[in-house]
């Protein structure tokens, strides 16, 4: 992996091997399909997604970066399991990036058309924040080989 030079990071590799990122893939695929199916939905309007309820940002702990509450009753099973898996990477931003890249690579063949791929990438980029976790400062989700800092 060019961007993060992870070859030497054995701890990250073992974390990635242990992690089950399938619930994240399922959650994201369901989400983009649900967004596509929403009749008349403006794709740029604030999310009306029942799994991501908007909350008052003033109510939350300033050190919890997301208004998404993992314990919320409205959370989907896939999202909750996904967030639990991603939680393992929270204090290693290089490893969090690698996990996101792995999700992208696993799903890239299943995405139909540029629009679906772009929407998947958008949701994936923001997945850590949706889970109330820190996002990596930089993370390239392009699946083609080569090329740094292409977003």
């Amino acid at each position: 992996r060019q961007q993060w030079e992870l070859q030497g990071d054995r701890r990250c590799q073992s974390q990635l091997e242990r992690a089950n990122l399938r619930p994240c893939e399922q959650h994201l695929m369901q989400k983009i399909q649900r967004d596509e199916d929403s009749y008349g939905r403006d794709p740029y309007s604030p999310s009306q997604d029942p799994y991501s309820p908007s909350q008052d940002p003033d109510r939350r702990d300033p050190y919890s970066p997301s208004p998404y509450d993992r314990r919320g009753a409205g959370s989907s099973q896939h999202q909750e399991r996904c967030c639990n898996e991603l939680n393992e990477f929270e204090n290693n931003q290089r490893c969090m990036c690698e996990a996101l890249q792995q999700i992208m690579e696993n799903q890239s063949d299943r995405l139909q058309g540029r629009q679906q791929e772009q929407q998947f990438k958008r949701e994936l980029r923001n997945l850590p924040q949706q889970c109330g976790l820190r996002a990596p400062q930089r993370c390239d989700l392009e699946v083609e080989s080569g090329g740094r800092d292409r977003y």
Partner: antibody
Framework: QVQLMESGGGVVQPGGSLRLSCAAS????????MHWVRQTPDKGLEWVAY????????DYVDSVKGRFTISRDNSNNTLYLKMTDLRPQDTAMYYC?????????WGQGTRVTVSS | DIQMTQSPSSLSASVGDKVTITCRAS??????LSWFQQKPGKAPKILIY???TLQSGVPSRFSGSGSGTHFTLTISSLQPEDFASYFC??????????FGQGTKVEVK
Amino acid sequence: QVQLMESGGGVVQPGGSLRLSCAASGFDFPGYGMHWVRQTPDKGLEWVAYIWYDARSEDYVDSVKGRFTISRDNSNNTLYLKMTDLRPQDTAMYYCAVGAPLEGYWGQGTRVTVSS
Amino acid sequence: DIQMTQSPSSLSASVGDKVTITCRASQNIADYLSWFQQKPGKAPKILIYAASTLQSGVPSRFSGSGSGTHFTLTISSLQPEDFASYFCQQSYTSPTWTFGQGTKVEVK
């Protein structure tokens, strides 16, 4: 190539209003959270506001809560900061910046001066 | 809130000198730290992110190190274009960011 261009700054009297704009290009704007940051010679850099990629939520520094509103138009790749009830201490250079995971890209800034 | 304390606030150096600037966080921020360079009248330009990762296109004389609460920016051999202000930024509490007060590198 990521480009951010702020506009809308100017001189305004205390209690007045301004709306800053930030035109974005060279990246997938609708897929990233966005920030406003300001800079003064005495206080240095201060984070001001953040908006989620899909505008579902916003965050503000305490000193501007209730006075400033961050918003975005993803169809036009534009970020906004509506500033009301402006005070002399809001005088600063205002920058827009991209959020994670594309941190580090800032615009050139637009100057806001609040003075009677 | 996390405070970022940067030192020194200014320093005088000559071309070819090794320059070290430090940034301390009031609590553990892991490696969620960036270093920026700013020249008068210009926007801040990122040099380093994730404490030690060099931004693409930035000369290799710039390097960053540290984790937790103590971080360092080193310029191994100062060049004429490096006379500028430098500041650190933490994004551990993202989307809230906090910044160091800055270090001005001047000609000796």
